[in-house]
């Protein structure tokens, strides 16, 4: 909501919900950085060191099985995402510790920010994906044993990209840089032009295409994976199935404060009382919603040490028997032993 | 040479409006800098009272936010205060004046002459 | 609001005499950058406020050098090496660090 209606309460920089209300002061206090400011700058210190190590080596350990492991394609791309992201923190840090200050120009103001977003984009369709492919898996097994191919991975994660993007430009678009005078400071933010209906529906559109509707068809689909699954109890690979499902979980647990504070900051007046307890706590919601950009390599670590039973292999071992485990399809009973063997040899990971 | 001009009524009613023109010349107001409203009250009392930027982003003093507008006309080079539900503690000189600079090094360089208001019924 | 104390409220002086104007301030106005907003402006009778400091310490174009600023966090102060006819007025400091924005009250410079 940054966007400038030329009036600012405590703006919280760079995330896209604000709406800039210039005629409210930006700093009441001078020198002292707010409590939500405060906690996150921690949680983007954490983010980014665990983010970029942890992201980084999951790139690494998948970039080498994504020719032959279609698992591997979309654990790659998801931490790719996640990477990116990552590389916009010190950034965004910096704005922070400079009260919400942005010297670093209005490329980098229109660029930076939108990584969140493109982020979240990028995962959520990724994700999607990732959610057919199990669900073709367990309810299409037939199919995948004939089309289910890294080519077609590969297409599939150009396709969530490409998509991502342009979702991603409206934001793009409409972040500008402006300039303060008591304190002299430039700000980043998004500039609606004084158009509540387009702030709005924005928002509205990140809500929906965000974070409600990927939410009600994944909850769909892993009801119905779940329920096969749990049914025949005749799947090898509930590994990734269960390692997906905590993604895809944690994906919505930490979108959730941004989502609802950027829908109501959009449908409230940037005076009112609530708006601006909202924009106080704006970068915090910011940085909470940034722990998606971590939390991947510690679902990788956690599940890994769960199916070990404890920590006997090296990171990237561990991570390579994650992330890169082979799917055996043995859904239907009619299917005969030269069927699945077949299947073991053609299908590829999920 | 940057020079400023205020104009408007000299009286005006309680509860009335006061709406005051700030004439720039020698620089566009959309080039560059904060363009501001100050009044000094009878006692020699300064106060700022907001300004609209280049951009055309507006600042207001909280004690006035509730009554303050500035506006401006990019085609005339001007500048507008408008300053409702006025009262006689609204009596003073209302000044325009430009602030900016080299970032960081902002102040008031150019000033206004300034134009009298006195509110009385 | 940031509270702005300058003393004193009149100063008479002898010409050629130095002078010494202060500014205090319930906070400190040393922005979270470093910098310190504190500008000192005169004003002559019948006049507009004309800038002499800005960032406590920088004379503005123009301004002759017997006009010094100096001080830190919440102490600031102006000082005139050696007072002639034409200094003579009100002098303002302004604090542009906090918002709003806020000017002293104010210090007349008269003849003795």
């Known amino acids: 909501m940054d966007s400038f209606n030329y009036t600012t309460p405590d703006y919280g920089h760079y995330d896209d919900k604000d709406t800039l209300d210039l005629n409210t002061p930006v700093d009441k206090t001078s020198n002292t950085l707010r409590v939500p400011d405060i906690l996150a700058l921690v949680i983007f210190a954490v983010v980014f060191l665990v983010g970029v190590l942890g992201n980084a080596l999951v790139v690494w350990v998948t970039a080498f099985e994504a020719k032959r492991t279609i698992n591997a394609i979309w654990f790659l791309n998801l931490a790719v995402a996640d990477f990116l992201s990552c590389l916009a923190l010190p950034i965004l840090f910096t704005s922070i510790v400079q009260h919400h200050h942005w010297p670093f120009g209005g490329a980098a103001c229109s660029i930076l920010p939108s990584l969140i977003l493109l982020n979240m984009y990028a995962s959520i369709l990724l994700l999607a994906t990732i959610s057919a492919d199990r669900f073709l898996l367990v309810f299409k097994p037939i199919w995948c044993q004939n089309f289910r191919g890294a080519g077609l991975a590969w297409i599939a994660c150009a396709v969530a990209w490409g998509l991502a993007l342009l979702l991603t430009i409206p934001s793009f678009l409409y972040r500008v840089v402006r300039e303060e005078y008591f304190p002299p400071k430039v700000l980043c933010g998004v500039d609606y032009s004084h158009d509540k209906r387009r702030e709005r529906a924005v928002a509205i559109v990140r809500l929906v295409l965000g974070f409600l509707w990927p939410l009600l068809t994944l909850t769909i689909c892993y009801t119905f994976i779940l329920l096969r699954t749990w049914s025949r109890r005749a799947t090898r690979s509930t590994k990734t199935l269960k390692v997906v499902v905590a993604v895809v979980a944690s994906f919505f647990i930490f979108w959730l404060p941004y989502q609802v504070t950027g829908i109501m900051m959009s449908f409230l007046e940037p005076s009112s009382p609530t708006f601006l307890l909202l924009k106080k706590l704006d970068s915090l919601c910011v940085s909470f919603a940034y722990i998606n950009c971590c939390i991947n390599p510690i679902i990788y670590v956690v599940a890994g040490q769960g199916f070990q039973g404890r920590l006997r292999k090296s990171l990237p071992s561990l991570l390579r028997n994650v992330l890169t485990e082979e799917s055996v399809v043995r859904e239907s009973k009619s299917f005969t032993r030269s069927t699945v063997d077949t299947m073991a040899q053609k299908t590829q990971a999920v | 040479d940057v020079q400023l001009q205020e104009s408007g009524p000299g009286l005006v009613k309680p509860s009335q409006s006061l709406s005051l023109t700030c004439t720039v010349t020698?620089?566009?107001?959309?080039?560059?800098?904060?363009w501001n409203w100050i009044r000094q009250f009878p006692g020699n009392k300064l106060e700022w009272m907001g300004y609209?930027?280049?951009?055309?982003?507006?600042s207001y003093n909280p004690s006035l936010k509730s009554r303050i507008s500035i506006t401006r006309d990019t085609s005339k080079n001007q500048f507008f205060l408008q300053l409702s539900s006025v009262t006689t503690e609204d009596t003073a000189t209302y000044y325009c004046?430009?602030?900016?600079?080299?970032?960081?090094?902002?102040?008031?360089?150019?000033w206004g002459q300034g134009t009298s208001v006195t509110v009385s019924s | 609001d940031v509270v702005m104390t300058q003393t004193p409220l009149s100063l008479p002086v002898s010409l050629g005499d130095q002078a010494s104007i202060s500014c205090r301030f319930s906070?400190?106005?040393?922005?979270?950058?470093?910098?310190?907003?504190l500008q000192w402006y005169l004003q002559k009778p019948g006049q507009s406020p004309k800038l002499l400091i800005y960032?406590?310490?920088n004379r503005f174009s123009g301004v002759p050098d017997r006009f010094s600023g100096s001080g830190s966090g919440t102490d600031f102060t102006l000082k005139i090496s050696r007072v002639e006819a034409e200094d003579l007025g009100v002098y303002y400091c302004?604090?542009?660090?906090?918002?709003?924005?806020?000017f002293g009250g104010g210090t007349k410079l008269e003849i003795k």
């Open positions: 004046a430009r602030y900016g600079g080299n970032y960081p090094t902002y102040a008031m360089d150019y």
């Open positions: 020698g620089y566009s107001i959309t080039s560059d800098y904060a």
């Open positions: 609209i930027s280049y951009s055309g982003s507006t």
């Open positions: 906070q400190s106005i040393v922005y979270s950058n470093g910098n310190t907003y």
């Open positions: 960032k406590v310490s």
């Open positions: 302004f604090q542009g660090s906090h918002v709003p924005p806020t």
